[in-house]
Interface confidence: low
Amino acid sequence: PPRGRILGGREAEAHARPYMASVQLNGAHLCGGVLVAEQWVLSAAHCLEDAADGKVQVLLGAHSLSQPEPSKRLYDVLRAVPHPDSQPDTIDHDLLLLQLSEKATLGPAVRPLPWQRVDRDVAPGTLCDVAGWGIVNHAGRRPDSLQHVLLPVLDRATCNRRTHHDGAITERLMCAESNRRDSCKGDSGGPLVCGGVLEGVVTSGSRVCGNRKKPGIYTRVASYAAWIDSVLA
């Protein structure tokens, strides 16, 4: 089943997010991802936990998962590099780099997204865009076309309240509000974009969606700049 957790959003403008990737297992959407270099897609490490014996591929240039689109192309994965400290039972270090079998053919609908290298928290209240093909309602309906939602960044202290995530949000993680609008199952690995720059990756822990007391958790890419650079080098 798709991993992760867009509720309360709307259909995205077609191909307006050319960095958006669908990480697929045996031809079906599993997780979101974001093109960060011509041959590399960043996603969430836990996404591959369900992929023990399947074919992992990456779909780029897509709006609809099912309809033919001239910009769509499915790439095989040459190499999967989960963060060395990621573990199945924690949300920490939940990052995965997928090296495509060849450099992506770039164009208006396929383009890497600049990612944040300055290790500083995004200001609380900043509106950030999260997109994905994750479920759109609590009944588990999966969309065919890319969805997105704008979410305000939530300060870490609030996110760490006992009633919220109870101290689990380290400096390497960030939160966004989840009051009826939220990332949800199948959005894991997708991008949280603030001011046109990749700031976070949707974590893939199992979490109730759309509940304001359980904010969305995102891995801060700036905190992992050294690791990302070392893999992409």
Epitope: G54, K55, V56, V81, S230
Partner: antibody, heavy 119, light 108 residues
Framework: EVQLQQSGPVLVKPGASVTMSCKAS????????MNWVKQSHGKSLDWIGV????????SYKQKFKDKATLTVDKSSSTAYMELNGLTSEDSAVYFC????????????WGQGTTLTVSS | EIVLTQSPALMTASPGEKVTITCSVS???????LHWYQQKSGTSPKPWIF???NLASGVPVRFSGSGSGTSYSLTISNMEAEDAATYYC?????????FGTGTKLEIK
């Protein structure tokens, strides 16, 4: 213990085809890609291609695209390579080698199958 | 296709001698994608060093690997008779995977 057991040596005539096998044991066959590598006598190693045993998906080095066909039988955890239109240039030792999505180097090698093409 | 050129092609070393084999890559690759294999006559290659500098299981600590970009090397700090073999570098950076030309190391 991981093992890749390859079929025995083969002597064939030019123009013929041959299929060699590689039986895997000691691990879940579908969880790792299977590669094939050619080594001509006294020469270096030449990667032929790779197959994903789960899906049957393949990728070949350009010069082997019309020469080699990679297949698997999941039920017996066996990988196969068929070589067609054989010439003396195809005389070599052929290795099946584990490695792929979950292993980014060639970690286990079969013992090799020696192919001799001679009239 | 990425071409890997090893030097020297053949070398002879005395026991206890320091040995360095180099691998020149035609275009820059990630150090995590450069590996070394050891092959003795009549046997299959064995993984020896992976990701430029990580020794495979059972490889003596007198072996080490280093490098980045287009230049990589394998070093034996004190040559021993059992190290006589052919060594190949290999890249996992992009399809098609390619191997180096090989370095045959003999003992004096």
């Amino acid at each position: 213990e991981v093992q890749l057991q390859q079929s025995g040596p083969v002597l064939v005539k030019p123009g013929a085809s041959v299929t060699m096998s590689c039986k895997a044991s000691g691990y879940t066959f579908t969880e790792y890609y299977m590669n094939w590598v050619k080594q001509s006598h006294g020469k270096s190693l030449d990667w032929i291609g790779v197959i994903n045993p789960y899906s049957g998906g393949t990728s070949y080095k350009q010069k082997f695209k019309d020469k080699a066909t990679l297949t698997v039988d999941k039920s017996s955890s066996t990988a196969y390579m068929e070589l067609n239109g054989l010439t003396s240039e195809d005389s070599a030792v052929y290795f099946c080698v584990r490695g792929g999505l979950r292993r980014n180097y060639f970690d286990y090698w079969g013992q090799g199958t020696t192919l001799t093409v001679s009239s | 296709e990425i071409v890997l050129t090893q030097s020297p092609a053949l070398m002879t070393a005395s026991p206890g001698e320091k040995v360095t084999i180099t691998c020149s890559v035609s275009s820059s690759i990630s150090s995590t994608n450069l590996h070394w294999y050891q092959q003795k006559s009549g046997t299959s290659p064995k993984p020896w060093i992976f990701g430029t500098s990580n020794l495979a299981s059972g490889v003596p600590v007198r072996f080490s690997g280093s490098g980045s970009g287009t230049s990589y090397s394998l070093t034996i700090s004190n040559m021993e008779a059992e190290d006589a073999a052919t060594y190949y570098c290999q890249q996992w950076n992009s399809y098609p995977f390619t191997f180096g030309t090989g370095t045959k190391l003999e003992i004096k």
